[in-house]
Amino acid sequence: APTSSSTKKTQLQLEHLLLDLQMILNGINNYKNPKLTRMLTFKFYMPKKATELRHLQCLEEELKPLEEVLNLAQSKSFHLRDTKDLISNINVIVLELKGSETTLMCEYADETATIVEFLNRWITFCQSIISTLT
């Protein structure tokens, strides 16, 4: 059974992940971003089911495409925090949260999504898990 300290750690990690995903979403999905039309042509694969921490495997598998899109966003008039560091931080959190004991084969939904839908989905996931922990 998880201890209160491990639950607290999980909650903090989820909150960090949530903040990073929200920061990306707010950064790209605004009218100051001149590359938005291009970024929204990228397809992202959505999890068929995302209710447990182990389902973060599906997010991990999409981090490389996410990095590619964020690299595209960088321009003189628009700047996100260093993309490589940001994705690396997310990756570290995801690996810790999902655990490495069981390797899950991610099951994806049939329909793909824009980066905005993708980020919203994982933000909702984080919020949902946090609410069950508190």
């Epitope: 999905n29 009218y31 100051k32 001149p34 938005l36 039309t37 291009r38 970024m39 929204l40 042509t41 990228f42 397809k43 495409p65 590619e68 595209l72 321009s75 008039s77 329909e111 793909t112 824009t114 905005v116 839908e117 919203n120």
Partner: antibody, heavy 124, light 108 residues
């Protein structure tokens, strides 16, 4: 209802500059979130994206034009323009101006409003 | 430069299903959009993001994508569907925004 109207000379001599203007009514080119594009169609052929200007003034072009194109906006007249330098017969086409709008907050962009197109012939 | 490849023409009888393919190396990770252009008119979007149908577009229009191929399907094609159809997408880095060569659909 947004309407776009292209205007400019129908005949341009080789090596000269093609200049076209798109006048927008029913919407402002300075309102956030829209891209204002030029697209052309060679006679009996397919469509080719030329470039766009964003409401903020940022521009983007088709790399195949090799820096011959310049798109600019005039918010006071609610117009945006295309200048294409060093034209050849290969630039003979119907030129469309179009707006790229977005499907809500989650969706992507698409060309939602178009002008009726203007034929430009490059010939001496 | 990046290319999207379409068949030049497709013919069907009224009521039959018409399928128009569009192939491009980046399509596994890039959305395809489909525009219909009737003679002498500006293009109109019929499918967005591989398979989403804008409001006002008849249900007989649908889209799908698998691997490097996107497909526009018109189930029970009608005479008024006769037009040129163009797929539109971007290359893998989204630097090249490209229309396919177009497919002339004839509904005989």
């Amino acid at each position: 209802q947004v309407q776009l109207q292209e205007s400019g000379p129908g005949l341009v001599k080789p090596s000269q500059t093609l200049s076209l203007t798109c006048t927008v009514s029913g919407g402002s080119i300075s309102s956030g979130g829209y891209y204002w594009s030029w697209i052309r169609q060679h006679p009996g052929k397919g469509l080719e994206w030329i470039g766009y200007i964003y409401y903020s003034g940022s521009t983007d072009y088709n790399p195949s034009l090799k820096s011959r194109g310049i798109i600019s906006g005039d918010t006071s007249k609610n117009q945006f323009s295309l200048k294409l330098n060093s034209v050849t017969a290969a630039d003979t086409a119907v030129y469309y101006c179009a707006r790229e709008g977005r499907f809500g907050e989650l969706g992507s962009y698409y060309f939602d409003y178009w002008g009726q197109g203007t034929l430009v012939t490059v010939s001496s | 430069s990046y290319e999207l490849t379409q068949p030049p023409s497709v013919s069907v009888s009224p009521g039959q299903t018409a399928r128009i393919a569009c192939s491009g190396d980046a399509l596994p990770r890039k959305f395809a959009y489909w525009y219909q252009q009737k003679s002498g008119q500006a293009p109109v979007l019929v499918i967005s993001e591989d398979s989403r149908r804008p409001s006002g577009i008849p249900e007989r229009f649908s889209g799908s994508s698998s691997g490097t191929m996107a497909t526009l399907t018109i189930s029970g094609a009608q005479v008024e569907d006769e037009a040129d159809y163009y797929c539109f997408s971007t290359d893998s880095s989204a630097n090249h925004r490209v229309f396919g060569g177009g497919t002339k659909l004839t509904v005989l």
